[in-house]
């Protein structure tokens, strides 16, 4: 059962796991959400009556009844872990922690103008959990405006104290502020020789590097495939660190595996969501229950649902036993990952799907597109909306581009002469204009938020966000599409789409079918030299075939500029400008979205 | 053991510049700043400015600025002060001070080590 | 910028005597003051700092105390190798600056 509210002057007796400091019972809370065996925790806040040694610890609990005693103590704050709810959960910190100094391993200090500046070196700088900023009010005149960059094993601060003028904060890498490089490749036949900070057993390099990336001192990692030659280091994934933040040597070496943390690019990838299967293989662990099943995604199915269960075991039954049900092993163990992985035994093995909550909506995969034609197919397009005027009479005016429960991304320019959010309305999950009747259900806009530096769609900024009046249930039909990293800045896409229901050809009418069509980028030194005209700057994508023929139109504006990476698709371009439609050598223009993430980012994440 | 040691006695001539070094050991060079205090002959000390050898920030004060150029060289932990456009009241001994441990906030603090010091003697 | 103020200039004490030393600031510099000792021909030496603790090595025969604008290094039995020239600095605000000098001599 998810039980979100906090329990004030009450602390659960027993099941400590471990203790940690934290600023607050709201971060306290987030701790154990992402602690692989933590349900509940008790935070002790500052306070006369308590012992100051014990203020801001986070006792991180556990239970097999997933409950504990509870007992009155003031200063105390106990609650439960989110692993028992269905919402989305984010590690994103933002909070500014006044007269309060987190320590940790203090690697790097620098001058700061403000606390914010401070916060964006740590968030962009490999190594650093979290930070402690001197005011100028601070005493020490040396140490006014000091941004100190700090780090330390478990990326939660070592101990919490008070310290006047002075504040602290977190890393916003888990909030996709970073601008550091998003390396996604696994190179093979590599082994990064760099010290280990930990290891665990993982079935393949991909579930390495996703462990990796949510291990808060990994910055890359070397895995031993199935076929290593010393078998006690087979399936052994290696988390690694380096002062550099980079690994010093690669060595050649046949059947291992080694990549980068996904750190900077977390929001865009999933790193918690591990969904395969894994055949003829035994994951190893303590056993929580075995329960009969009719399939291995019957069994994944009651791991998911058993809170405690974090991998597990499925035989198949032998011919006609058990009514054709197998056995399912339920387990867990004190870092989420297999104690052992075993091979040719016949099981099939897996993780639990509890933590995908954990990765962002739009990391999931969709279904298969349907490969030529121009007419889409329901589904096809999950974030594409199509935003409606009701004045003087309703029609389609714009697309748009689901990236938040509430939040729809479009063009600036699609609302000239659009006085009043109330006379839009926006409609997602669909394929046909024709299926909008009057009885259609439509998100309100509560609030247009167009770029404050816009002024027209061929001079850029032509960036706008709709604020809906309620939040978008993702389904199948409906669901966001990711950001761009700001670390994947230098990726050079090849898979990308526009789509729309706009004009087909520059005299035309709005189509009744949501239209695709595949577009090559084209870069900016290209783009300049057909818009000789205009200014083409690095807030705007091009794309376009040399000859034609295909490009966005009339009634595609606001609309998206999906592009296929690494199986996510990303949200690179909204459809801005260009001459005319479908010209030669006139390629369309795009608003380039990955250069307003922080713009983005600020407006929807706003208090 | 903690040291600073400054390179040796100069003479110049007015309107020259001069460069005095100072080399520090037995502690982590780019943890603590750095200050450049000089003492005229016979007269009390007078603060010239400080350098982050981190990051390399300075600052000056007011009655040096833009004759004084605070320089470091992490590699060889050495921080460096440049003075120009010398003139007789330029002679004195210029010391290096080592000043708070950037790396750590706390409140109060002092110049703990000194260097042996330059005499710099400007006459024409 | 700060005016550091020592007085007297010159201290006539004789050994195992107190021997106290005044420093006023022209405007308050909390408790971000701090005390050196020179001898002729060597570099200062850190005393005290903060106002009133006193650094590695230093005896506690050397106390600092006061804040604000009003400070006071007391020596309280001097001895023979304490004969020297005593300064305070300020370290609150930019520029930093230090006082004139107390010259302590044998009396």
């Known amino acids: 059962e998810c039980v979100t509210q906090l329990l004030k002057d009450t602390c659960f007796e027993g099941g400590d796991i471990t203790t940690v400091f934290t600023p607050s019972a709201k971060y306290c809370q987030v701790v154990c959400t992402y602690h692989p065996r933590c349900l509940l925790f008790t935070f002790t806040a500052e306070s006369p009556s308590e012992d100051p040694t014990r203020w801001f610890t986070c006792v991180l609990k556990d239970s097999v009844t997933e409950t504990l005693p509870r007992v009155n103590r003031t200063a105390a704050i106990s609650g439960y872990s989110f692993k028992q709810c269905s919402h989305q959960i984010s590690a994103c910190n933002k909070d500014i922690y006044v007269d309060l100094d987190m320590k940790g391993i203090n690697y790097n200090s620098s001058v700061a103008k403000s606390a914010q500046e401070c916060q964006e070196r740590c968030t962009d700088d490999v190594h650093c959990h979290f930070f402690t900023y001197a005011t100028r009010q601070f005493p020490s005149l040396e140490h006014r405006n000091i941004c100190l960059l700090k780090h330390t094993q478990t990326g939660t601060p070592t101990r919490i104290t008070k310290l006047d003028k002075v504040v602290s904060g977190f890393s916003l890498k888990s909030c996709a502020l970073s601008n550091l490089a998003c390396i996604r490749d696994i190179f093979p036949n590599t082994v990064f020789a760099d010290s280990n900070i930990d290891s665990v057993m993982a079935p393949d390099a991909f579930v390495c590097g996703r462990i990796c990336t949510h291990h808060p001192g990994c910055l890359f990692f070397t895995f031993f495939s199935q076929e290593w030659p010393k078998e006690s280091q087979r399936n052994l994934c290696l988390l690694k660190t380096s002062e550099s933040g980079l690994p010093s040597t690669r060595i050649k070496k046949s059947k291992a595996l080694s990549g980068f943390s996904l750190q900077s690019c977390r929001h865009s990838i999933p790193v918690f969501c591990h969904s395969s299967f894994y055949h003829d293989t035994d994951f190893l662990g303590e056993e929580l229950d075995i329960v009969a099943a009719k399939s291995h995604e019957a069994c994944q199915k009651l791991c998911t649902n058993a809170v405690r269960c974090q991998f597990f075991t499925y035989t198949p039954a032998q011919a006609s036993c058990n009514e054709g049900k197998g056995k399912c092993y339920l387990k867990l163990s004190s870092n989420g990952s297999p104690t052992k992985i075993l091979h040719g035994r016949g099981g099939i093995s897996g993780y639990t799907l509890r933590l995908c909550k954990m990765d962002n909506e739009c990391t999931t995969k969709i279904k298969p597109r349907i490969v030529g034609g121009t007419a889409s197919v329901r589904g096809e397009w999950p974030w594409q909306v199509t935003l409606h005027t009701t004045s003087p009479t309703q029609r389609h005016l714009c697309g748009g581009s689901i990236i938040g429960n509430q939040w729809i991304l479009t063009a600036a320019h699609c609302f000239y002469g659009v006085e009043s959010p109330k006379i839009l309305r926006v409609y997602s999950g669909i394929l046909n204009q024709s299926e909008i009747k009057e009885d259609t259900s439509f998100f309100g806009v509560q609030e247009i938020i167009i770029h404050d530096q816009y002024k027209m769609a061929e001079s850029g900024y032509d960036i706008a966000l709709l604020k809906l009046e309620t939040t978008v249930n993702y389904t199948d039909s409906q669901r966001p599409i990711c950001l761009p990293s700001k670390g994947d800045r230098n990726v050079i896409y090849t898979d990308c789409w526009v789509t729309g229901w706009g004009y087909r050809k520059l005299r035309d009418k709005i189509q009744n079918t949501l239209q695709k069509a595949k577009i090559p980028l084209v870069t900016n030194e290209e783009c300049q030299k057909r818009y000789r005209g205009h200014k083409i700057t690095h807030k705007m994508i091009c794309a376009g075939y040399r000859e034609g023929g295909k490009d966005a139109c009339k009634g595609d504006s606001g609309g998206p500029l999906s592009c296929k990476h690494n199986e996510v698709w990303h949200l690179v371009g909204i459809t801005s400008w260009g001459e005319g439609c479908a010209q030669r050598e006139r390629p369309g223009v795009y608003t380039n979205v990955v250069e307003y993430v922080d713009w983005i980012l600020e407006k929807t994440q706003a208090v | 053991e903690v040291q600073l040691v400054q390179s040796g006695a100069e003479v110049k001539k007015p309107g020259a510049s001069v460069k005095v070094s100072c080399k520090a050991s037995?502690?982590?060079?780019?943890?603590?700043?750095m200050h450049w205090v000089r003492q005229a002959p016979g007269q009390g000390l007078e603060w010239m400015g400080i350098?982050?050898?981190?990051?390399?920030?300075?600052s000056y004060a007011q009655k040096f600025q833009g004759r004084v150029t605070m320089t470091r060289d992490t590699s060889t932990s050495t921080v460096y002060m440049e003075l120009s456009s010398l003139r007789s009241e330029d002679t004195a001994v210029y010391y290096c001070?080592?000043?708070?441990?950037?790396?750590?906030?706390?409140?109060?603090?002092?110049?703990?080590?000194w260097g042996q010091g330059t005499t710099v003697t400007v006459s024409s | 910028e700060i005016v550091m103020t020592q007085s007297p200039a010159t201290l006539s004490v004789s050994p195992g005597e107190r021997a106290t030393l005044s420093c006023r600031a022209s405007?308050?510099?909390?408790?971000?003051l701090a005390w050196y000792q020179q001898k002729p021909g060597q570099a200062p030496r850190l005393l005290i700092y903060?106002?009133?603790t006193r650094a590695t090595g230093i005896p506690a025969r050397f106390s600092g105390s006061g804040s604000g604008t009003e400070f006071t290094l007391t020596i309280s039995s001097l001895q023979s190798e304490d004969f020297a020239v005593y300064y305070c600095?300020?370290?609150?605000?930019?520029?930093?600056?230090f006082g004139g000098g107390t010259k302590v001599e044998i009396k």
């Open positions: 001070a080592r000043g708070a441990y950037l790396l750590e906030l706390y409140y109060y603090y002092g110049m703990d080590v």
């Open positions: 037995g502690y982590t060079f780019t943890s603590y700043s």
């Open positions: 350098i982050n050898p981190s990051g390399g920030s300075t």
């Open positions: 405007q308050s510099v909390s408790s971000n």
């Open positions: 903060g106002a009133s």
């Open positions: 600095q300020q370290f609150n605000d930019w520029p930093l600056t």
